[in-house]
Interface confidence: medium
């Protein structure tokens, strides 16, 4: 059973909000981790979107618009990435990672290597 689980694919219509789920296996406690989210478009390297530990401890990646937001549900041991006002360019692979509260680049890269499991968010154009 993997430490992290994400749905293999999700879809929603343009202009709507989609929420991607990243579930931490229940022998770990998401309450002590930051949740990191990355986006990878076809042919591009992964892009850091955001880190979320709590409402008062979070950070947004460079040039990442506020329609990308993070949250956590400690009861369900889940991290979420919400993307509002879905646009065609949001069609991509989205990766979550868990790590310590620090937002240092080296740590993010280490988590990327160790803990990442992909989920695809596909925008269905109506």
């Amino acid at each position: 059973q993997p430490v992290l689980h994400q749905p293999p694919a999700m879809s929603s219509a343009l202009g709507t909000t989609i929420r991607l789920t990243c579930t931490l296996r229940n022998d770990h406690d998401i309450g002590v981790y930051s949740v990191y989210w990355y986006q990878q478009r076809p042919g591009h390297p992964p892009r850091f979107l955001l880190r979320y530990f709590s409402q008062s401890d979070k950070s947004q990646g460079p040039q990442v618009p506020p329609r990308f937001s993070g949250s956590k549900d400690v009861a369900r041991n889940r991290g979420y990435l919400s993307i509002s006002e879905l646009q065609p360019e949001d069609e991509a692979m989205y990766y979550c990672a868990m790590g310590a509260r620090s937002s240092e680049k080296e740590e993010r890269e280490r988590e990327w290597e160790e803990e990442m499991e992909p989920t695809a968010a596909r925008t269905r154009v109506p």
Epitope: H5, P7, S12, I18, R19, T21, R25, A75
Partner: antibody
Amino acid sequence: EVQLVESGGGLVKPGGSLRLSCAASGFTFSNFEMNWVRQAPGKGLEWVSGISSNGRYINYADSVKGRFTISRDNAKNSLYLQMNSLRAEDTAVYYCARVVDFDQDYNGFDYWGQGTLVTVSS
Amino acid sequence: DIQLTQSPSFLSASVGDRVTITCRASQGISTDLNWYQQKPGKAPKLLIYAASNLESGVPSRFSGSGSGTEFTLTISSLQPEDFATYYCQQSYNWPYTFGGGTKVEIK
């Protein structure tokens, strides 16, 4: 085969107490979030309380907050609902319900018990 | 808390009819909505999860759609065994809430 069996219901006077139990079998109980849902006679479903798989996180409907206590014993594969200060409006069939496994990406109640009737009347 | 408003609360239909039940959430809940069927004296049964996914063993005449605040349950061709009460339920966050139910009866 997954089974959830509730017990502990019965007739109680207003202000009284009851403890409901839900015995689980056929699955690894400690991996699953569990909930209590009730249904008053002739009425709809009302979520009462939920508890995370490790028992660390708990929530209640406003209508029972401060009066009901949910708990679980993973070693005994059992879920409990301690109901105090009971009122006539707590009269209902009480169901325990399992939330789907953690690696599913939704939180539906995939298995339910048969229910136990609690009647609060003087 | 998130409120769910189901409509209609009562529906009279004939075998073979196409039936649609609507559930409206008081705030956006992505696709975290489930549908249940309940027959008298029985526990509810999960039909549709995550707005549009058919639970294993549920006939394909049942389908669900929607996201955000508007959701629908459709029965494409009503069968005798489908006469029951249907409930929507949000699982976006605790406290979980149910819609008021839709009773489908024989016309």
